[in-house]
């Protein structure tokens, strides 16, 4: 989380009630989408 334009953390931890599907559907940046796929790989 964090909520700032200068934060370096890109949603490192899932927030409450947040799923991988919701992250995928709301991801805007390349970094966020990379993190989504990182989670997918790690869950295999």
């Amino acid at each position: 989380g964090g909520g700032g334009s200068k934060h370096k953390c890109f949603r490192k931890d899932l927030e409450q009630n947040e799923t991988l599907e919701s992250i995928m559907s709301t991801a805007e940046s390349e970094e966020e989408l990379k993190r989504y796929f990182y989670y997918l790989e790690g869950s295999k």
Epitope: G1, E28, S29, E32
Partner: antibody
Framework: QVQLVQSGGGVVQPGRSLRLSCAAS????????MHWVRQAPGKGLEWVAV????????HYSDSVKGRFTISRDDSKNTLYLQMNSLRAEDTAVYYC????????????WGQGTLVTVSS | DIQMTQSPSSLSASVGDRVTITCRAS??????LAWFQQKPGKAPKSLIY???SLQSGVPSKFSGSGSGTDFTLTISSLQPEDFATYYC?????????FGGGTKVEIK
């Protein structure tokens, strides 16, 4: 430095179409989502649409859903808003805006372009 | 949708005054709140993100506070260049929504 330069506004009749452009420079355009926000004359700000990196995700406000289409051309570092079936209530200054990701605040805005829908 | 209610809608103040603007969200938005300043005919300027963090280059006379549903923007000592309209915005979820604005005018 980051620049967002807009073009494409003008006067258009109700029911017609118009396409707005936002040319980006000074940052890695292809890596970030981009937004459109509008402001009717004398009124407040209204979020219109967002397109993600690679165009994977698109979201629209209910007021423009089904009529407006957001798109991007990363080879030209340009964001677009295709506006169809325009209505008088779409008359506004349209701004493009950048942010670093979902749940991040806008850090840069375009200069705005006026769209007037009138017969 | 999350409604953002700003108050007051307008205020008159003098140079040197301390000014406080409030913004209330219809549901909790954690600290996903930004403040913008807008002058006539100009694009909004980002002042504060994350409810309390100053954007780069913004003077420290601007400060923000709050979390959850209630937020404030404070200008510690109003200067002539600060007379403008101020907007809050939640970016917790789509659709992103703005407050109705607060016009700060010269008394």
């Amino acid at each position: 430095q980051v620049q967002l330069v807009q073009s494409g506004g003008g006067v258009v009749q109700p029911g017609r179409s118009l396409r707005l452009s936002c040319a980006a420079s000074g940052f890695s355009f292809s890596s970030f989502g981009m937004h459109w926000v509008r402001q009717a004359p004398g009124k407040g700000l209204e979020w219109v649409a967002v397109i993600s990196y690679g165009g994977i995700n698109k979201h629209y406000s209910d007021s423009v859903k089904g009529r407006f289409t957001i798109s991007r051309d990363d080879s030209k570092n340009t964001l677009y808003l295709q506006m169809n079936s325009l209505r008088a209530e779409d008359t506004a200054v349209y701004y493009c805006a950048k942010r670093e990701g979902y749940r991040y605040a806008y850090d840069y805005w375009g200069q705005g372009t006026l769209v007037t829908v009138s017969s | 949708d999350i409604q953002m209610t700003q108050s007051p809608s307008s205020l008159s103040a003098s140079v040197g005054d301390r000014v406080t603007i409030t913004c209330r969200a219809s549901q909790g938005i954690s600290n996903y709140l930004a403040w913008f300043q807008q002058k006539p005919g100009k694009a909004p300027k980002s002042l504060i993100y994350g409810a309390s963090s100053l954007q780069s280059g913004v003077p420290s006379k601007f400060s923000g506070s709050g979390s959850g549903t209630d937020f404030t923007l404070t200008i510690s000592s109003l200067q002539p260049e600060d007379f403008a309209t101020y907007y809050c915005q939640q970016y917790n979820s789509y659709p992103l929504t703005f407050g109705g604005g607060t016009k700060v005018e010269i008394k």
